[in-house]
Amino acid sequence: KSPIFGPEEVNSVEGNSVSITCYYPPTSVNRHTRKYWCRQGARGGCITLISSEGYVSSKYAGRANLTNFPENGTFVVNIAQLSQDDSGRYKCGLGINSRGLSFDVSLEVSQGPGLLNDTKVYTVDLGRTVTINCPFKTENAQKRKSLYKQIGLYPVLVIDSSGYVNPNYTGRIRLDIQGTGQLLFSVVINQLRLSDAGQYLCQAGDDSNSNKKNADLQVLKPEPELVYEDLRGSVTFHCALGPEVANVAKFLCRQSSGENCDVVVNTLGKRAPAFEGRILLNPQDKDGSFSVVITGLRKEDAGRYLCGAHSDGQLQEGSPIQAWQLFVNEESTIPRSPTVVKGVAGGSVAVLCPYNRKESKSIKYWCLWEGAQNGRCPLLVDSEGWVKAQYEGRLSLLEEPGNGTFTVILNQLTSRDAGFYWCLTNGDTLWRTTVEIKIIEGEPNLKVPGNVTAVLGETLKVPCHFPCKFSSYEKYWCKWNNTGCQALPSQDEGPSKAFVNCDENSRLVSLTLNLVTRADEGWYWCGVKQGHFYGETAAVYVAVEERKAAGSRDVSLAKADAAPDEKVLDSGFREIENKAIQDPRLFAEEKAVADTRDQADGSRASVDSGSSEEQGGSSR
């Protein structure tokens, strides 16, 4: 007895598609062995039509695919544009066709369900609109026009020209009689339901001279598109529902039990709490299409998703829909990285961002997720030397440690910095990851003066006090600029006296600027690192002024603010609004993030739309 299992019989209609799932025991060998779909011949052989190794028979070219889902122990054969020639006996199996690890499937493709002569077949997707055309002769032009549905043996009136509408169709059907020149009336049914499928009869006149036309309406429930993404990665759902619903509220929902479909996000501003910080709904195009990006995929995100359009912003009977079945691969290529990073007010965080190591030359970005409207993610910094104006001096994106990870350092933290941030590149869009920054109680570990003023031509010494917990770390000073932080020479001045309960392992490391020039003005950071992994940093702004009195300046900690004042964005700060910068390439298959700059405030394009692992901010 074969352990392979599937449907023993599949019945369909010409022109339609089938999706055949075959189950196998998910042993290591089975998961990786060849999967095939073959047609049984009269003399016992089985001719391969498609296999997991890329073979596709000419009979199936352009209309079939085979997808393996090793996690589930299934593979799926999709066959489109069925014809009666496809009827026959098939096998789905593993290994070699003749070896017996297979399951017999009978596929029967019929012309259509018992169609009467002269029957017009209408095949329409669930939730869409159908127009049934009914011709008539001149003698029936003034007579009653009607549409009936065959229920069992009896025709039931659906609509007629005297104004009757069957209650099952209220609000979604109309009967149009064309101008006098055209001997035709049509019945338009919107928001099609599965229950609308069946045989219809349209009629002009009621006597023996009436004109009749048969119609067969097939309402197709969309087969879910199978999507297979990595744990911790990202997925993009592209939803194209057609221009007829361009002005209707859109939604993405996830099917739970039964017929329930819980809204994940919609254009009316609803968003499920589980997706906070990791979802964006891209504003729709004129044709009503939109896309939804979800990052930081979790095991529990797997399931069936529907996108649709309905004024309520949620699934209702008759909503046009598209469906996906999302599988989340736990054998992920995306490495674990902290999903929560903690820092203290006045302190700093160093965030590690994974990217596809095959794309080391891609541009790296970091953006701040904003939940307003449908979610948006304005860029804050990139690896090409651009930093959003409000973050100058306190934000840096470093290519280190490299080989699939870059680092983002943010210091001078305030409570306003708490939130969700996305790491992304202009390469593989599946590698978008999310990190939440939390601001917790506490004091910064590194102690530096507040703002410092240097005098032209003189020497300036700026101290940085490192507590003993960083005794094994490399300590450095650097000068911040848009492209990073250039290391500077510094002097170890021995143990620091700035810490209570801290032994000889605490350190005072000073930055010395000799013969200060105007070019020395700017932001300086002191920090700790271990190899290419960065820990805490502290920032000091050095202003340069004309000489007032001779001598060198040695800045002491006493003159420093214990923690920098919280910076409040001035009222002139202008958000990048949805309408300001739109770049659909930032979703899905984008290859480059738009290099749009807003001269007014140095803003840049944004990734726009209308139980965590945790990491402290102090070290790797």
Epitope: V10, S17, V18, L194, A197, K221, E259, R304, E317
Partner: nanobody, 128 residues
Framework: QVQLVESGGGLVQAGGSLRLSCAAS????????MGWFRQAPGKEREFVAA??????????YSADSVKGRFTISRDNAKNTVYLQMNSLKPEDTAAYYC???????????????????WGQGTLVTVSS
């Protein structure tokens, strides 16, 4: 969820036939995958047959032990699923349960965990 009521069970001689019916309430019955399971005294519930319709195509599944003898079918207009049982054997004696699996039917149709609505069951006894 849908409510399910089975009927058609009874006592039959080996080699005989029975037709079980399962009537479902719920507007969107047609979008559910429907299955039949059985449970003999002292044994685990086992998969018998399943059927799934997506508006255009029908998929039928059955267990090896009933292949060629039992046929599952559905009538969406009547919200009913049937199990035609021919060539019955004494080992077919069990309580037969109808079950409904909400869309999508991507999960294994043989797994009872993928069904969220169950009937009360109807008893089939096959005497030798």
């Amino acid at each position: 969820q849908v409510q399910l009521v089975e009927s058609g069970g009874g006592l039959v001689q080996a080699g005989g036939s029975l037709r079980l019916s399962c009537a479902a309430s719920g507007r969107t019955f047609s979008s559910y995958a429907m299955g039949w399971f059985r449970q003999a005294p002292g044994k685990e519930r086992e998969f018998v047959a399943a059927i799934h319709w997506n508006g255009a195509s029908t998929y039928r599944y059955s267990a090896d032990s009933v292949k060629g003898r039992f046929t599952i079918s559905r009538d969406n207009a009547k919200n009913t699923v049937y199990l035609q049982m021919n060539s019955l054997k004494p080992e077919d004696t069990a309580a037969y349960y109808c079950a409904a699996s909400p869309p999508p039917t991507v999960g294994d149709v043989r797994d009872p965990a993928n069904y969220d609505s169950w009937g009360q069951g109807t008893l089939v006894t096959v005497s030798s």
